[in-house]
Interface confidence: low
Amino acid sequence: RKIPKVGHTFFQKPESCPPVPGGSMKLDIGIINENQRVSMSRNIESRSTSPWNYTVTWDPNRYPSEVVQAQCRNLGCINAQGKEDISMNSVPIQQETLVVRRKHQGCSVSFQLEKVLVTVGCTCVTPVIHHVQ
Amino acid sequence: GITIPRNPGCPNSEDKNFPRTVMVNLNIHNRNTNTNPKRSSDYYNRSTSPWNLHRNEDPERYPSVIWEAKCRHLGCINADGNVDYHMNSVPIQQEILVLRREPPHCPNSFRLEKILVSVGCTCVTPIVHHVA
């Protein structure tokens, strides 16, 4: 089985590295920069020409348990008159993040890293026009 | 930590919260999703608040490559293709979790790290500050 890039590295292994069983890795989930602040512009989700809402998904077997997802409010974009302009499109912007998934098999517990795609917000784009032959 | 439901038949020794350190399978679930935003969509060019994507590479981190968005304009692109300075292009930021090699250079020992990335830009009506 091919080991994915997360473990495969060109680094020389220092003597101080902790011993790790084959096929697994040691992960400290005490988060570095836990308390850093997002300095995003105030309520841009409402002020955007492609506004969005937030919903919180909660899963007790995931770390972190809360993941916030955005959903575009409109198909079109909001024009200067505050009306929806369907000649333009509101589209989601997405970003991958890592989570730790806990799996129960009988009474034993295992942990798995998982990539999750998070919708962060929306942007207004000119639509791609498909010309029919 | 977070609380989880437990199989009532299991011994009571199991902690309800996530332990501080866990052994994790090396295979990452969903790891083959496309991580290059330039290939996954062309929104960065078609947006009314277009952005450029800058490659941030760090071999001590997984994923080692992260793409950072930088808005191209102060204003937004209007219907005529010109920059309208009565609107603002602003970055959409997101906190994501990555793995940081700890101790440094160790191939299979990591710590979770929260980093702030600009994912793209959106066009907003500006905040008008009235001077008293």
Epitope: S39 | L74, G75, Y85, H86, N88, V90, P126
Partner: nanobody, 119 residues
């Protein structure tokens, strides 16, 4: 940015900010500062389209923001400096024509120049 440095209280400094790669003919340029352990705050702003200027109360009458359109440069003349003016000073462009916007509305930022005022 350039022009930072150390000065005695009551002294003067002139900061300059050249916008390379962009012509800000109709936008906002702002000077912001951040002292250790404090939030970044707006000090002075100029609307390059018409030259309108705005100042924080703490610097009114002491600081002057100006522009040289030919050089695509904005200046901050700082007179009667006080120890509490000690901070890292940043030049930024943004604000979408509404210059008194918070720092996060400003898109392009300089690297910063240190100003230290000793008593």
């Amino acid at each position: 940015e350039s022009g930072g440095g150390s000065v005695q209280a009551g002294g003067s400094l002139r900061l300059s900010c050249a916008a390379s790669g962009y012509t800000y003919s109709n936008a906002c340029m702002g000077w912001f500062r951040q002292a250790p352990g404090k939030e970044r705050e707006g000090v002075a702003y100029i609307y390059t389209g018409g030259g309108s200027t705005y100042y924080a109360d703490s610097v009114k009458g002491r600081f002057t923001i100006s522009q040289d359109n030919a050089k695509n440069t904005v200046y901050l003349q700082m007179n009667s400096l006080k120890p509490e003016d000690t901070a890292m000073y940043y030049c930024a462009a943004g604000g979408g024509g509404y210059c008194r916007a918070p720092p996060e509305e400003y898109v392009f930022w300089g690297q910063g120049t240190q100003v230290t005022v000793s008593s």
